[in-house]
Interface confidence: medium
């Protein structure tokens, strides 16, 4: 019988058991060494065990797989491909496993994979075809619905000579495989900008989390196609002002709620339209908490309490009067 137990408890497989049978094909429902398994809960947990590769003998019943806190380093192509395939695997959590490279086709042969969490891995090399599995211009649709990529930015010295934003976006857009993606979390990645085409090609998004990045402006980002977007998290960025085009697009999204806390809003004459909009809109959550960061005389003033008279710009001096 398989070494699994009831829903309320997990069975562990002893390492000596695994080595004893390693010469034979694995039993279909045995529990891998250093993992805990519950067939009733369809869950396997291989957590904080310093694993350097994905166990080969995962039970076929697994629906929820936790491989967090390990030392995986690289996810090769077909890292989860098994015969028979892991047809039930729906949720895969690889967070905090020291991954720095995810290769093309790493998640192939997982027909039911709906949630993938790669957070807290320093992904210096994320293949453009990590999620699409092939370099075709239009790939087979991925079953992914939730993709969690929070804090995947590697240290500065480990980054390739290319834009980190560009690398992530290439993986999101390759083969148009993620058309069904409904939740995308990209928090805490030091993003300076959002490539303009990324959102247009993810039309099913309901939730987009870009909080705790370094976004300065949304001027070139279009939200127009995201007609189902419910929540947009932009807290803790470097936003100075939202311009008319962005305000109109957000207002036009029928279900949207926007979170804008903790941005360094610049309360000068360019802020007038945003203040007017904030007073009228219901889409911004906690709008009464938004305060000015600059100029100094406006610091900590509440945006909703400002009048047009408060929002002035210092006149630009003609060149002849400017001092060096």
């Amino acid at each position: 019988s398989s070494p699994t137990s009831s829903a309320s408890s997990f069975s562990s497989s002893a390492p000596f058991l695994a080595s004893a049978v390693s010469a034979q094909p694995p039993l279909p429902d045995q529990c891998p060494a250093l993992c805990e398994c519950s067939e009733a809960a369809r869950t396997v947990k291989c957590v904080n065990r310093n694993l350097t590769e994905v166990p080969t003998d995962l039970p076929a019943y697994v629906r929820n797989l936790f491989l967090t806190g390990n030392q995986l380093a690289v996810l090769p192509a077909g890292a989860f491909a098994r015969r028979p395939p892991l047809a039930e695997l729906a949720a895969l959590n690889l967070s905090g496993s020291r991954l720095d490279e995810v290769r093309a086709g790493a998640f192939e042969h997982l027909p039911s994979l709906r949630q993938l969490d790669l957070s807290h891995n320093p992904l210096a090399d994320l293949s453009p075809f990590a999620f699409s599995g092939s370099n075709a211009s239009v790939s087979a649709p991925s079953p992914l619905v939730e993709l969690i990529l929070n804090h995947i930015v590697p240290p500065e010295d480990e980054r390739q000579n290319r834009s980190f934003e560009g690398m992530v976006v290439a993986a999101l857009l390759a083969g148009r495989a993620l058309q069904g993606l409904r939740r995308l979390e990209l928090a805490s990645n030091h993003f300076l900008y959002l490539p303009r085409d990324v959102l247009a090609q993810l039309p099913s998004l309901r939730h987009l989390d870009l909080s705790n990045n370094s976004l300065v402006s949304l001027t070139y980002v279009s939200f127009r196609n995201l007609t189902h977007l419910e929540s947009l998290h932009l807290e803790d960025n470097a936003l100075k002002v939202l311009h008319n085009g962005t305000l109109a697009e957000l207002q036009g999204l029928p279900h949207i709620r926007v979170f804008l806390d903790n941005n360094p809003w610049v309360c000068d004459c360019h802020m007038a339209d945003m203040v007017t909009w904030l007073k009228e809109t219901e889409v911004v959550q906690g709008k009464d908490r938004l305060t000015c960061a600059y100029p100094e005389k406006m610091r900590n003033r509440v945006l909703l309490e400002l009048n047009s008279a408060d929002l002035d710009c210092d006149p630009i001096l003609p060149p002849s009067l400017q001092t060096s």
Partner: antibody, heavy 116, light 107 residues
Amino acid sequence: QVQLVQSGAEVKKPGASVKVSCKASGYTFTTYDIIWVRQATGQGLEWMGWMNPKSGNTGYAQKFQGRVSMTRNTSINTAYMELSTLRSEDTALYYCARGGLEPDYWGQGTLVTVSS
Amino acid sequence: DIQMTQSPSSLSASVGDRVTITCRASQGIRNDLAWFQQKPGKTPKRLIYDASNLQSGVPSRFSGSGSGTEFTLTIRSLQPEDFATYYCLQYNRYPRTFGQGTKVEIK
């Protein structure tokens, strides 16, 4: 796994109030709206309103405006729906569900019976 | 409020039949429509979202189509476990509104 577990059945007198709880687990409570839907015996589904657990914001169907209150306690991942001034036609199964657009996970339902 | 009118309100069919249920919105709702299945004593189960997207784990004999005001749920070859009540839900505008339901019974 995502689960919504509701409080047990209630029997109330006309004019009283009822408060139904909905405890969420298996996901981050504050990232999805909770909606409430009711179903009288042998009848169809009726949407009552929504509550955003992160902000506490709510929206109610006109029919229930002034009689319903949807709240939450984020420290215990629980949403509440309170319906006041109960009448016999409020006898129904009350469901909580996850999702601001189309709900994907539902609680098991709480039967509220209003009878004198 | 947007009214959702489902037809028929009930139908009798045999195993293997092709079944079509229609939902009509009182105003355009783009593709903001979901279909749910409910069996007696059970909670509703989502089958289709965004008018035509099949929920993961739902058999491919179910399909949805339509946009604007006219929507259809089709069961290609009715199975014994499909006998249930089906509801449409529009989520284009608040308040959300359900159709009144279509009961699919065994002939």
